[in-house]
Amino acid sequence: KSPIFGPEEVNSVEGNSVSITCYYPPTSVNRHTRKYWCRQGARGGCITLISSEGYVSSKYAGRANLTNFPENGTFVVNIAQLSQDDSGRYKCGLGINSRGLSFDVSLEVSQGPGLLNDTKVYTVDLGRTVTINCPFKTENAQKRKSLYKQIGLYPVLVIDSSGYVNPNYTGRIRLDIQGTGQLLFSVVINQLRLSDAGQYLCQAGDDSNSNKKNADLQVLKPEPELVYEDLRGSVTFHCALGPEVANVAKFLCRQSSGENCDVVVNTLGKRAPAFEGRILLNPQDKDGSFSVVITGLRKEDAGRYLCGAHSDGQLQEGSPIQAWQLFVNEESTIPRSPTVVKGVAGGSVAVLCPYNRKESKSIKYWCLWEGAQNGRCPLLVDSEGWVKAQYEGRLSLLEEPGNGTFTVILNQLTSRDAGFYWCLTNGDTLWRTTVEIKIIEGEPNLKVPGNVTAVLGETLKVPCHFPCKFSSYEKYWCKWNNTGCQALPSQDEGPSKAFVNCDENSRLVSLTLNLVTRADEGWYWCGVKQGHFYGETAAVYVAVEERKAAGSRDVSLAKADAAPDEKVLDSGFREIENKAIQDPRLFAEEKAVADTRDQADGSRASVDSGSSEEQGGSSR
């Protein structure tokens, strides 16, 4: 008995599509072996029509595809534009056609429903609009026009020219009589429901001379598009519902049990808590299309998603919809990285961001997710040397450790830094990841003075105190600039006196600037790292002033000034809206944007994602 399973019979109609799913035991060998769909011949052979190795028969060119879903142990054969010639016996299988790891499928394509003569067939998607055209002769121009639906043996009136509308069609049907030149009336039905499908009869006049026209309305429920993405990666649902719903509220919902479709996000401002920090609904185009990006995919995100349009912002009967079946591959190529990073006020965090290692030359970005309206993610820093003005001196994106990971360091933390941040590149859009920064109680581990003033031409020594917990770490000083933090020589001055209950392993490491120049003004960081993995940092701003009295300056913690005031918003920054996030290749064009203003940073509430993958600011 073959372990392959599938539909034994498939019945369809000419012109339609079928989507045949074949199930196989998801062993390692089966997942990677050839998948095929073949047609059985009269003499017992089976001629391959399409396979997972790229072969497509000329009979199927341009109308069929085969997609393997190894995580689920399924593959799907889609065949479009069916004709009666496609009727026959087929096999879906694994390996070699003649080897028995297969399942027999009977495909029967019929001519379509038994239609009355002169019947016009209308095939329309659920939620869309149909226009049924009804011609008539001159003698019936002034007579009553009507549309009936055949229910069982009886025609039931749907609408007529005297103003009657069947209650099932209220608010979504109209009868239009064309100008005097055209002997035609039409019935327009909006927000089509599955129950609208059936045989219709339009009629002009009521006597034996009346004109009649038969119509067959087929309402198609959209086949879900199969989407297969990696755990921890991202997915984009592109939703094109047509210009007729351009001004109607849009939604994305996820089907739960039964009829329910729980709103994930909509344009009325609703967003499911489970997607906080990891979803963007991109602004819609004039044609009513929009897209939704979800990052940090979880196992439980798998399921059927519908996008649609309805004034309520949720699925209702007659909503035009598009459907996807999302599978989340747990054998992910995207490595685990912490989804929550914790830091203390005044301290720092170092965030590791994965990217596709095949795209080491891609531009790396870090943005701050904002939940207002439909969500947006303004950029804060990139790997090309741009940093948002109000983050100068406290934010750096480093290409290290490389080989599929970059590092973002943010210091001088305040409660306003709590929130969700996205790591992304201008390459593989599936490698967008989300991290939540939480600000917790505690003191920064590294101790440095506040503002420091150096004197031109003199020597300046700035201390950084490292507690004993960092005894095994490499300690460094560097000068911050837009492209990173350039390492500087520093001196180990022995154990620090700045820590209570800390033994000889604490350290005081000083930065010395000899013969200070104007170029020395700026932000300096001291920090710890292990190899290419960065830990905590602390920042000091060094101002340079004219000489007042001779000598050198040795700054202690006690003599340090207060921290500098927060910088005023600068007009030279750019904000990347959702559109750019959707296609990071647009980032480059945004760089030139000037004289825009960000909304003033409000405090952002932190929402716990419930993840166990947490990391403290000092760990990696």
Epitope: E9, V10, V13, S17, G303
Partner: nanobody, 126 residues
């Protein structure tokens, strides 16, 4: 909610035929598949057959044990699924349950179905 009511069960002789019906009512608009499962005393509930649809296309799935003997069909207008059982065997004795689903990843898996009927007893005597 969708309500499912099975009918047509009963006591028959081996080799006889029986036709089960499953009438769906309520919000059947988004149902995507209807199927039959059975449960013999002291055994797990097992897949028998399922029919799924999309527009005018139907897909019929059968368990190996009933292939060639059982046929599933549906009447869209009546929101009813039928199970025609021919050449019945004593092994077919069980409570037969009708199930409906809005999303089916694998039609053989009971947990993929959202709605269930109360069941109808089929007894095949030798």
């Amino acid at each position: 909610e969708v309500q499912l009511v099975e009918s047509g069960g009963g006591l028959v002789q081996a080799g006889d035929s029986l036709r089960l019906s499953c009438a769906a009512s309520g919000r059947t608009r988004t149902t995507y598949g209807m199927g039959w499962f059975r449960q013999a005393p002291g055994k797990e509930r097992e897949f028998v057959t399922t029919i799924t649809w999309s527009g005018p296309t139907n897909y019929k799935y059968y368990a190996d044990s009933v292939k060639g003997r059982f046929t599933i069909s549906r009447d869209n207008a009546k929101n009813t699924a039928y199970l025609q059982m021919n050449s019945l065997k004593p092994d077919d004795t069980a409570v037969y349950y009708c199930a409906a689903s809005t999303v089916l990843t694998d039609p053989r898996v009971p947990t993929e179905y959202d709605y269930w009927g109360q069941g109808t007893q089929v007894t095949v005597s030798s």
